[in-house]
């Protein structure tokens, strides 16, 4: 798909920036822009990403207890948080026609959840209730996307600050299930 | 030292038109791409055009598109704003402005000069 | 009228937070990056931060931005007298033809 990804103490996902998204076509002009096409441009160029950790979007690991009510879940879970800046703030020489670059603004990217899992986990309980079973559905990896009015809003959890911060609120897409397995799914214990 | 001069503002009648430069200086030139930026006695911040390194990269306010043109000259670090057809509500200070950070906003600003339409 | 809605006004007293917000719609703000400025009396303006929450070097890490939605805002921590300014979030706007838009402005009052 045109995404690097290495490790560190986190995932560091990298866009290819030459295969962001392009506005919808009736938002762009008919021009034709890519100077990789025609030639590229000269060879210094200002928006060459020098420092790439700048903007990346960061899959950190964290591991979790799931709870449901006074249970607990015997192993702890692991899953992601997206955190991290999408930019891009510099360009690939190579992007040059894929994006407005010279615009003081352009599309937000945000990183945030790209796929989930689905993992079984066994709560126990305590005064000697039967232990219960509960799929919980996790974040499996993240990726930077273009904002647009229908992301939901727990996704695009505010990245004013650069602390990654662990995601709370409804999950995208829930399935049909009791109020006591979301909060079996969501209640956070980082 | 990073540096955005512009000249050729003055009082004009409207209908007619007016030619501004903006020189630069302290910067690889073209490494930038340069916007016009106006602001009306006592009012706030108006964006009237941009362009990146060549006539193909060009964007303008709804509000000046038709009469107003950009352009920018790498060899002589330049940058212009024709301005055709002159209105009274044209009448501002007009800053030249650059980014070398694609969306990073207009970084460099110069001190801007005003251009009064009047009869 | 302004594309970008600013309060006209806000102030504090040196030391304090003030907060400045910027609304707007997708076209703009819900989709794009927004970028604030810091116009002092009489001065040019001067780009304080930039694709939301990232400051040019040299800004004081007491400005933050911050975006939610179709809404943005500047904080300005441990206020003080010489940030008495205008401030104006500005951001690009992908209807019609598209342009870049400004708010109104906030004028900032250090008490």
């Known amino acids: 798909q045109g995404w690097q990804a290495f490790k560190n103490d986190a995932t560091e996902i990298i866009p290819e920036l030459g295969e962001y998204p392009e506005p919808p076509p009736e938002l762009e002009n008919n021009k034709t822009m890519n100077r990789a096409e025609n030639g590229g441009r000269p060879p210094h160029h200002p928006f060459e990403t020098k420092d790439v950790s700048e903007y990346s979007c960061r899959e950190l690991h964290f591991t979790r207890y799931v709870t449901d009510g006074p249970c607990r879940s015997a192993k702890p879970v692991t899953e992601l948080v997206c955190s991290g800046q999408c930019g891009p703030a510099r360009l690939l020489p190579n992007a040059i026609g894929r994006g407005k670059w010279w615009r003081p603004s352009g599309p937000d990217f945000r990183c945030i959840p790209d796929r989930y899992r689905a993992q079984r986990v066994q709560l126990l309980c305590p005064g000697g209730e039967a232990p219960r079973a509960r799929k919980v559905r996790l974040v499996a990896s993240c990726k930077c996307k273009r904002l647009t009015r229908f992301h939901n809003q727990s996704e695009l959890k505010d990245f004013g600050t650069e602390a990654a911060r662990p995601q709370k609120g409804r999950k995208p897409r829930p399935r049909a299930r009791s109020a006591k397995a979301n909060q079996a799914e969501l209640e956070n214990a980082y | 030292e990073v540096q955005l001069v512009e000249s050729g503002g003055g009082l004009v009648q409207p209908g007619r038109s007016l030619r501004l430069s903006c020189a630069a200086s302290g910067f690889t030139f073209d490494d930038y791409a340069l916007h016009w930026v106006r602001q009306a006695p006592g009012k706030g911040l108006e964006w009237v055009s941009g362009?990146?390194?060549?006539?193909?990269?060009?964007d303008y306010a709804d509000s000046v598109k038709g009469r107003f043109t950009i352009s920018r000259d790498n060899a002589k670090n330049s940058l212009y704003l024709q301005m055709n057809s002159l209105r009274v509500e044209d009448t501002a200070l007009y800053y030249c402005a650059g980014n070398n950070r694609g969306y990073g906003g207009l970084d460099v600003w110069g001190q801007g000069t005003t251009v009064t339409v009047s009869s | 009228q302004s594309v970008l809605t600013q309060p006209p006004s806000a102030s504090g007293t040196p030391g304090q937070r003030v907060t400045i917000s910027c609304s707007g719609s997708?076209?703009?703000?819900?989709?794009?990056?927004v970028n604030w400025y810091q116009q002092l009396p009489g001065t040019a303006p001067k780009l304080l931060i930039y694709n939301n929450n990232q400051r040019p070097s040299g800004v004081p890490d007491r400005f933050s931005g911050s975006k939610s939605g179709t809404s943005a805002s500047l904080a300005i921590s441990g206020l003080q007298s010489e940030d008495e300014a205008d401030y104006y979030c500005a951001a690009w706007d992908d209807s019609l033809s598209g342009e870049y838009v400004f708010g109104g402005g906030t004028k900032l009052t250090v008490l």
């Open positions: 997708w076209s703009n703000i819900g989709s794009n990056t």
């Open positions: 362009i990146g390194w060549d006539e193909d990269m060009i």
